[in-house]
Interface confidence: low
């Protein structure tokens, strides 16, 4: 449940617009080296379930948390906006770093410079004693639902249960679910969106909405981006993942509402239990649901889910699987692109997305699932590019 | 039934504007795309381009991205083709037809537009 | 674009006889995720507009009579009428929708 590193060796971090390698000794150094600057605005990402902003230090080569000391909201904001978050900041506070962290960045109020790495130095002292912990949206919370929802072998969901999933539609037709990360930006599977299923045009989003008949009254949101991942293998089904911008953004409400993308440090346990949502066949070879549907399903750890027995080696980093073994509860068909959360420190947070199987609840087949952890800087990369 | 009602004929000036009707009934207007396709005389069928009634999204064939103009107007059911600039080569049939996932399954009768001083 | 080519141009058979019209597209219409070939089937008579026979390559349309059958896959595809019938003059035209929408040339059947 790690980044997946890139070509370079351990020292380098790879240009995404070149391709080139660069030294790590040169990420976040205030200077340029990759041809669209990409070195300098990778440069902060939110740590584990509590959202512990760190900045990376081209010094000590390595992520520290940010000390609370003399933080202020404008520091969140540009934080924010720096992850790819456009006008959008949540919340800021200082926390108890329970980590162990012995070395932390911390700002030089004395430095005029608006750029925040600037201002920020490395210390190995935090007066505070306090790091921040940063919200740049209000995701993955939902209303107090008391009854549990549960795709094969599933319940039907109730209306705000799972308040990010997305039916995705060509031609008034449900072919895919998808997951609200921001009011603009809709997480789905690549293979969703292969050729000729390519043109943001032909797609349709329908949000907050339970039945799938109810939503030829409605009036969905158009698409205008579908952005696929460029390592995606349409044979193996490695990267599966895309991501939709919305023509126009989304209104949250009770009913509609983002799911946090994970971040690093999560720690996942093994046979954690996990959720799956969608509109999908509700047995194998069978027809759309037209009612929302959401399971229980415990992930299954890749060594296992990888033995001769099971996906005997099909099971690459970039994917998660979760089921039982004995089959009984799985995703299936026009599931897929759908969400996988998960519920750790009171937030839901977008795990997989829904990916590929063989078949649908059959015993040693579970659902396999793109691993969303390994592709939130991929995420937010293209978050940023479009602003 | 499912029908799709177009004008038999429009006669227009070289030069001039003309604005192409189909008229929809006997389905839900605007959950089905709706397609233009362009047959000139003795030739094949060419794609013009599709607009959704509900959202109003277009879509265009590069070719006739700057010679057509698609529109709807919901309270009537109707989708529209604006052809501009109109000459002789634009002389054709017109049909509008709806999309049923990706194949056309409904088709208009066609308008013949002849263009000429 | 996918550039899409029907053969014969044109062709004239008597009435009962097996009828064969190819259509090639310059790349796959094949999608992995539906398995689905995104090539449909047109029938023009003389004066009239296009009518739908066949989609997703293989799938005849509802109302369609079984003598008329669609095959292929990828890139080679094949309009077949088993016995042609004498209402069976037209221009058949294939379509591509696999990256937005082209036609063929078309097939004129003519019956001797």
């Known amino acids: 449940w790690k980044f997946m590193g890139s070509k370079c060796s351990d020292s380098g971090i790879e240009c995404d617009s070149s391709g080139t390698c660069i030294s790590s000794s040169n990420w976040c150094d205030g200077v340029s080296h990759c041809p669209n600057g990409e070195d300098e605005n990778r440069c902060v990402r939110l740590y584990g379930p509590n959202f512990i902003l760190q900045v990376y230090s081209s010094q000590r080569k390595s992520w520290h948390p940010v000390c609370r000391d003399d933080w202020n909201e404008n520091y969140a904001r540009a934080a924010c906006r720096d992850m790819g978050y456009k006008n959008s900041f949540y919340s800021s506070q200082g926390i108890v770093d329970n980590s162990g962290a012995t070395s932390f960045m911390k700002l030089n109020t004395s430095a005029g410079n608006v750029d925040i790495y600037k201002k920020l130095y490395h210390s190995d002292a935090c007066s505070s004693k306090a790091v921040v912990s940063l919200r740049c949206i209000a995701c993955g919370v939902r209303s107090n639902l008391n009854r549990q929802s549960r795709i094969v072998g599933g319940q039907n969901a109730l209306l705000g249960a799972w308040p990010w999933q997305v039916s995705l539609h060509v031609q008034n037709i449900h072919v895919c679910g998808g997951s609200i990360i921001t009011p603009e930006w809709i997480v789905t599977a690549a293979h969703c969106v292969e050729k000729p299923l390519n043109s943001p045009w032909q797609w349709t989003a329908f949000v907050g909405t339970l039945r799938q008949s109810s939503m030829f009254y409605e009036k969905g949101h158009r698409v205008e981006k579908v952005i696929s991942h460029p390592n995606y293998d349409s044979k193996t089904k490695n990267n599966d993942i895309a991501l939709m911008k919305l023509h126009t953004p989304l209104t949250f409400n009770e009913v509609v509402k983002p799911v946090c993308l994970p971040n690093p440090g999560m720690m996942l346990e093994p046979e954690q239990h996990c959720w799956i949502s969608g509109w999908g066949a509700t047995q194998e070879k069978g027809k759309t649901s037209d009612v929302l549907n959401a399971a229980m399903v415990p992930l299954i750890e890749p060594r296992r889910c990888n033995n001769k027995y099971i996906y005997d080696g099909l099971i690459t980093p970039a994917m998660i699987c979760a089921g039982f073994l004995r089959g009984t509860v799985d995703s299936c068909q026009g599931d897929s692109g759908g969400p996988l959360v998960t519920l750790k420190n009171d937030v839901w947070w977008l795990i997989g997305d829904t990916s590929w199987g063989s078949g649908c609840a059959q015993a040693n087949r579970p659902g396999v699932y793109g691993n969303v952890t390994v592709f939130t800087d991929w995420i937010y990369r293209q978050m940023r590019a479009d602003d | 039934q499912v029908q799709l009602q177009q004008p038999g004929a429009e006669l227009v000036k070289p030069g001039a504007s003309v604005k192409l009707s189909c008229k929809a009934s006997g389905y839900s207007f605007t959950t089905y795309w709706m397609h233009w396709v362009r047959q000139r005389p003795g030739q094949g069928l060419e794609w013009i381009g599709i607009i959704h009634p509900n959202s109003g999204t277009t879509n265009y064939n590069e070719k006739f991205k700057s010679k057509a103009s698609l529109t709807v107007d919901k309270s009537s059911s109707t989708a529209y083709m604006q052809l501009s600039s109109l000459t002789s080569e634009d002389s054709a049939v017109y049909y509008c037809?709806?999309?049923?996932?990706?194949?056309?399954?409904?088709w208009g009768q066609g308008t013949t537009l002849t263009v000429s001083s | 674009d996918i550039v899409m080519s029907q053969s014969p141009s044109s062709l004239a058979v008597s009435a009962g006889e097996k009828v064969t019209m190819s259509c090639k597209s310059s790349q796959s219409l094949l999608n992995s995720r539906t398995r689905k070939n995104f090539l449909a089937w047109y029938q023009q008579k003389p004066g009239q507009s296009p009518k739908l026979l066949i989609y997703w390559a293989s799938t005849r349309e509802s109302g369609v009579p079984d003598r008329f059958t669609g095959s292929g896959s990828g890139t080679d595809f094949t309009l077949t009428i088993s016995s042609v019938q004498a209402e069976d003059l037209a221009v058949y035209y294939c379509?591509?929708?696999?990256?937005?929408?082209?036609f063929g040339g078309g097939t004129k059947l003519e019956i001797k």
């Open positions: 379509k591509q929708s696999y990256n937005l929408y082209t």
């Open positions: 037809a709806r999309l049923l996932w990706d194949y056309f399954d409904y």
